[in-house]
Amino acid sequence: WGFKDGIFHNSIWLERAAGVYHREARSGKYKLTYAEAKAVCEFEGGHLATYKQLEAARKIGFHVCAAGWMAKGRVGYPIVKPGPNCGFGKTGIIDYGIRLNRSERWDAYCYNPHAKECGGVFTDPKQIFKSPGFPNEYEDNQICYWHIRLKYGQRIHLSFLDFDLEDDPGCLADYVEIYDSYDDVHGFVGRYCGDELPDDIISTGNVMTLKFLSDASVTAGGFQIKYVAMDPVSKSSQGKNTSTTSTGNKNFLAGRFSHL
């Protein structure tokens, strides 16, 4: 699971980023006139995203294969990674331009500056991830993905600064999951809830994924999780890989990970 020469193995696309999100009509894809697309966004407390806002979202992983209205009657869609079925093999905003016929039917790209943002793709050497709204309690029905992608050869040192999630025996309600990979399928490290600070974690490669999920009821204080890039070191001084399972109700852990 490395990132080399600008290519990474697995693609995780964000459904919402930098305040931008995609909307379609209840009746399905490509059913909204320009006026209706504006209305959809405004009913939710936002407005149609500008081209710049859509591009800013795309740069942190917002990828949708559906053309939608933007501000000023523009239509397009954001492509992070080119594919055969979407985007004509290009990346960037696939721009259909400003439409003369505002009765054409497309989807909508909304921007809501008040939305509690979470997740994204991170390439900085260090960063702190916070649950949405921290230090206030997080909200119900949140799903956030943080994808860390550092330089090839670097590893990721993850440490928990604050941690308070709804406590339940299997961490089935609210939880943070850590994956030693660029997706939430491979390299499962552990699932965490409760209010005990989990131990530090070191990745085996240059990528890592954090997933935060909260259910439809009961919230808590939230979390702050910090990561720092670790430059390549000789094999003799690398952290020891261990495999641990904890069945306590504070943290539910399974899988392989590097413990400090």
Partner: antibody, heavy 120, light 106 residues
Framework: QVQLQQSGAELAKPGASVRLSCQAS????????MHWVKQRPRQGLEWIGY????????KCHQKFKDKATLTADKSSSTAYMQLSSLTYEDSAVYYC?????????????WGQGTTLTVSS | ENVLTQSPAIMSASPGERVTMTCSAT?????MHWYQQKSSTSPKLWIY???KLASGVPGRFSGSGSGNSYSLTISSMEAEDVATYYC?????????FGAGTKLELK
């Protein structure tokens, strides 16, 4: 099944405030929007506004923006509407009604209504 | 504001008779929805997305229309259909209802 249980009838004096409640059950409260509708005796239906419980965002008809304040308590799956500076014209039946978040909107479930009587 | 005008305001029909009521909007909408309200009860969703019958609504009801003009039709009037029917648009702020068509039994 979906149920919206509204609070009982209210009698209030002009100038006072009241808070009406609407407790939802049978579905995930934060996955739908909650609207409020006014119906004066022998008259039609008038949309007041809505709250998106997941975010707390509210939007009211301009006519009611100084009259109605909408809130929601996710822990109890209850929506509230506070009506302030009551006048005789506020005497009506008030309904809460659920809509999906999908555009365009419609109300698929209604509460039984709360009768508000403003009288000195 | 998108004003919905229902006509007629009051109508009466004999059992078995075909009934049509209309709703016109000042601004075009993609869909119209209809509610039935019987005296001293909450409104009930009756027809949504112009032509889809809500759960439990008899098949003698139908809805049609587009743009600014919509209608609700009962193919064969029955006594239990006596009620007030409201059209409703959920496309534009503010959401609006028509003033209602009161259907009585002749």
């Amino acid at each position: 099944q979906v149920q919206l249980q509204q609070s009982g009838a209210e009698l209030a004096k002009p100038g006072a405030s009241v808070r009406l409640s609407c407790q939802a059950s049978g579905y995930t409260f934060t996955s739908y929007w909650m609207h409020w509708v006014k119906q004066r005796p022998r008259q039609g239906l008038e949309w007041i506004g809505y709250i998106i419980p997941s975010s707390g965002y509210t939007k009211c008809h301009q006519k009611f923006k100084d009259k109605a304040t909408l809130t929601a308590d996710k822990s109890s799956s209850t929506a509230y509407m506070q009506l302030s500076s009551l006048t005789y014209e506020d005497s009506a039946v008030y309904y809460c009604a659920r809509s999906t978040s999908g555009y365009p909107y419609y109300f698929d479930s209604w509460g039984q209504g709360t009768t508000l009587t403003v009288s000195s | 504001e998108n004003v919905l005008t229902q006509s007629p305001a009051i109508m009466s029909a004999s059992p078995g008779e075909r009934v049509t009521m209309t709703c016109s909007a000042t601004s075009s909408v993609s869909f119209m929805h209809w509610y039935q309200q019987k005296s001293s009860t909450s409104p009930k969703l009756w027809i949504y997305d112009t032509s889809k019958l809500a759960s439990g609504v008899p098949g003698r009801f139908s809805g049609s229309g587009s743009g600014n003009s919509y209608s609700l039709t009962i193919s064969s009037m029955e006594a239990e259909d006596v009620a007030t029917y409201y059209c409703f648009q959920g496309s534009w702020y503010p959401l609006t209802f028509g003033a209602g068509t009161k259907l009585e039994l002749k």
